[in-house]
């Protein structure tokens, strides 16, 4: 067990052009506070995924009012450290998210308003018990300077807080086979309870005689580094020398999650999804309160009035869940009618309508021909939800308002020439062809494949297509 400590040194405009406007003004005085979220390992995780190592919220900083015309200075900060207690071994590698929040103190209806000013994230290696590590992170035009460290809570010591120390029983020396506890020379290492030979750096135990490995290590004594390259089976070949995970019980076998938590395997370990009221790597920590910073994504924590809800998270727009851990999909409101497809664009909901329906929610059934006039003698044809006009000869377009070029489709066959005519088109056929569209060949003996031509028309004369 131990505590991760975060000290914010400054939050203000970063170097370079484009200094941000002060977040506070004379009309809207405000104060800052910070939230830190820790996750084990170096995985790239979404900001809203659970803070499995823990989270903490700072106190509110002093009230700040911008001086008119002055650039945004470093803003006044809350006092004290942000402390995230961890109950299990310190994982050595971790991801962090640090959020800077602004609390507006103007005449807000319903109390103060919160808004996220900046969010920085990173992945680091850190040994417990080491010195403060300094860091600078930039988010847009803002710059955050901070230090952090992990320290073990007595009696735990070591880089992972897995070795135990006890006060010396004798003033001069430790008991047989027990070393002094550096750096606490006046204390002695507690009697070993882990399996003999269990790596003090990479292994730990919670029960006498066991040896459990920190992330990245494997083998019965946690002395073999995990390699992801040469593993053949889902959990790797059985040779301990290859550095692959040994096949056998999966990480979720026997369900390591306490208090009704459900276990799911991750590439290197397992993850517990805890029921309400429990948290920690194995859902072993109960009695969550607002002091534990249980609300994600800027949710405001309010102490619950009864044991059923030790706290309640008031979520900012766009987030939901008992810990504001889930993004609201407003399409869950089922807003689109008539089989429309819903799209949540963040700033708005959109419905993509099926053919034959329209309106922001696809609520309008395009009652095909109702109230639709087809011009120039066209007739409306219903079908498929989209009205269509069947246009009279010489007209086209959606409503038959456009004059059609009857020759555009090259209607005259066999090289016949097309002429537009007030009542349609006329084909002048090439020698040897006849018919309204020059579609019929004239027989070599002069007889046509057609019945005798109408009076006054010889084969080869232009035929008017009526």
């Amino acid at each position: 067990a131990g505590v991760f400590e975060l000290q914010i040194h400054s939050f203000g405009p970063g170097p370079g052009p484009g200094a941000p406007r002060s977040p506070c003004s004379a009309r809207l005085p405000c104060r800052l506070f910070f939230r830190v979220c820790l996750k084990p390992g170096l995985s790239e995780e979404a900001a809203e995924s659970p803070c499995a190592l823990g989270a903490a919220l700072s106190a509110r900083g002093p009230v700040y009012t911008e001086q008119p015309g002055a650039p945004a200075p470093d803003l006044p900060l809350p006092d004290g450290l942000l402390q995230v207690p961890f109950r299990d071994a310190w994982p050595g590698t971790f991801s962090f998210i640090i959020e800077t929040w602004r609390e507006e103190l103007g005449d807000q209806i319903g109390g103060p308003a919160w808004s996220l000013l900046a969010r920085v994230a990173g992945r680091r290696r850190l040994a417990a018990g080491g010195p403060w590590a300094r860091d600078i992170q930039r988010a847009g035009a803002w710059e955050l300077r901070f230090s952090y460290r992990a320290r073990c809570e007595p009696p735990a010591v070591g880089t992972a807080c897995t070795r135990l120390c006890r006060p010396r029983s004798a003033p001069s020396r430790c008991g047989p086979g027990l070393r002094p506890c550096a750096p606490l020379e006046d204390e002695c290492e507690a009697p070993l309870v882990c399996r003999a030979g269990c790596s003090p750096e990479h292994g730990f135990c919670e029960q006498p005689g066991e040896c459990r490995c920190l992330e990245g290590w494997t083998g019965p004594l946690c002395t073999v580094p995990v390699s992801t390259s040469s593993c053949l089976s889902p959990r790797g070949p059985s040779s301990a020398t290859t550095g692959c995970l040994v096949p056998g019980p999966g990480p979720c076998d026997g369900n390591p999650c306490a208090n009704g938590g459900s276990c799911s395997e991750t590439p290197r370990s397992f993850e517990c999804t805890c029921p309400r009221g429990f948290y920690g790597l194995r859902c072993e920590v109960s009695g969550v309160t607002c002091a534990d910073g249980p609300c994600f994504n800027g949710g405001l924590c309010v102490g619950g009035a009864d044991p059923d809800s030790a706290y309640i998270c008031h979520c900012p727009p766009g987030f939901q869940g008992s810990n504001c851990e889930k993004r609201v999909d407003r399409c869950s409101l089922q807003p689109c009618r008539n089989g429309g497809l819903c799209l949540d664009l963040g700033h708005a909901l959109r419905c993509r309508c099926r053919a034959g329906f329209a309106g922001p929610r696809c609520e309008h059934d395009l009652d095909d021909c109702a109230g639709r006039a087809c011009a120039n003698g066209g007739t409306c044809v219903e079908g498929g939800g989209a009205h269509r006009c069947s246009c009279a000869l010489g007209f086209g377009g959606r409503d038959c308002r456009e004059r059609a070029d009857p020759c555009a489709a090259r209607p005259c066959a066999h090289g016949g020439r097309c002429y537009a005519h007030f009542s349609g088109l006329v084909c002048a056929c090439a020698p040897g062809y006849m018919g309204a569209r020059c579609e019929f060949p004239v027989h070599p003996d002069g007889a046509s494949a057609l019945p005798a031509a109408p009076p006054g028309l010889r084969p080869g004369d232009p035929q008017r297509y009526l």
């Epitope: 727009p317 609201v328 407003r330 869950s332 409101l333 089922q334 807003p335 689109c336 009618r337 419905c351 922001p360 929610r361 609520e363």
Partner: antibody
């Protein structure tokens, strides 16, 4: 015609549990989300949240997280509101209402819940 | 959360009057404003949705208007059956919120 018919009035003691039903008819139940609204005696309307009738996923307004649970029996076109560990301040009329994409277009007649020791 | 304010909590009018009930949102709600009628027996009905669209079966004497943050419901020719409490509700941003209601009585 479209109807939402709710179960009858309930008289409960503090700490008990109540489950209210809302039976829908006249439309395809799973096409529309179902919402719940609370009205305390002499007060206005307060939106409690909704349940997606296609997936069964509930969504709660902040003041109704914890002791409140929305559920469905799709085969019976029925939505339910359950309130656990009842308190005096839960005394109210609870309405179910269908959402059509713009508004809650059809409402149940309301179910009165009285919590008294 | 968006606050909805109905400044008039009760209103007296005579039969045949033109009555207007107003509602103000604490921020722009992009016309996603609905009006509901609650009769003395407790039943609730939708009257107007999306600021000005009349719900099916609602008499044409009811109309709605507005934009941005200010909206109103008008009853052009008050009838006895219109005696009720009227609530506005914004559907633009979760959580949805209602106005406090305006109780309409006959003089």
């Amino acid at each position: 015609q479209i109807q939402l018919v709710q179960s009858g009035p309930e008289l409960k003691k503090p700490g008990e549990t109540v489950k209210i039903s809302c039976k829908a008819s006249g439309y395809t139940f799973t096409d529309y989300s179902m919402h719940w609204v609370k009205q305390a005696p002499g007060k206005g309307l307060k939106w409690m949240g909704w349940i997606n009738t296609e997936t069964g996923e509930p969504h709660y307004a902040d003041d109704f997280k914890g002791r409140f649970a929305f559920s469905l029996e799709t085969s019976a076109s029925t939505a339910y509101l359950q309130i656990n560990n009842l308190k005096n301040e839960d005394t109210a009329t609870y309405f179910c209402a269908r959402y059509d994409g713009y508004a809650m277009d059809y409402w149940g007649q309301g179910t009165s819940v009285t919590v008294s020791s | 959360d968006i606050q909805m304010t109905q400044t008039t909590s009760s209103l007296s009018a005579s039969l045949g009057d033109r009555v207007t009930i107003s509602c103000r949102a604490s921020q722009d709600i992009s016309n996603y404003l609905n009006w509901y009628q609650q009769k003395p027996d407790g039943t609730v009905k939708l009257l107007i949705y999306y600021t000005s669209r009349l719900h099916s079966g609602v008499p044409s004497r009811f109309s709605g208007s507005g934009s941005g943050t200010d909206y109103s419901l008008t009853i052009s020719n008050l009838e006895l059956e219109d005696i009720a409490t009227y609530f506005c509700q914004q559907g633009d941003m979760l959580p949805w919120t209602f106005g406090g209601g305006t109780k309409l009585e006959i003089k």
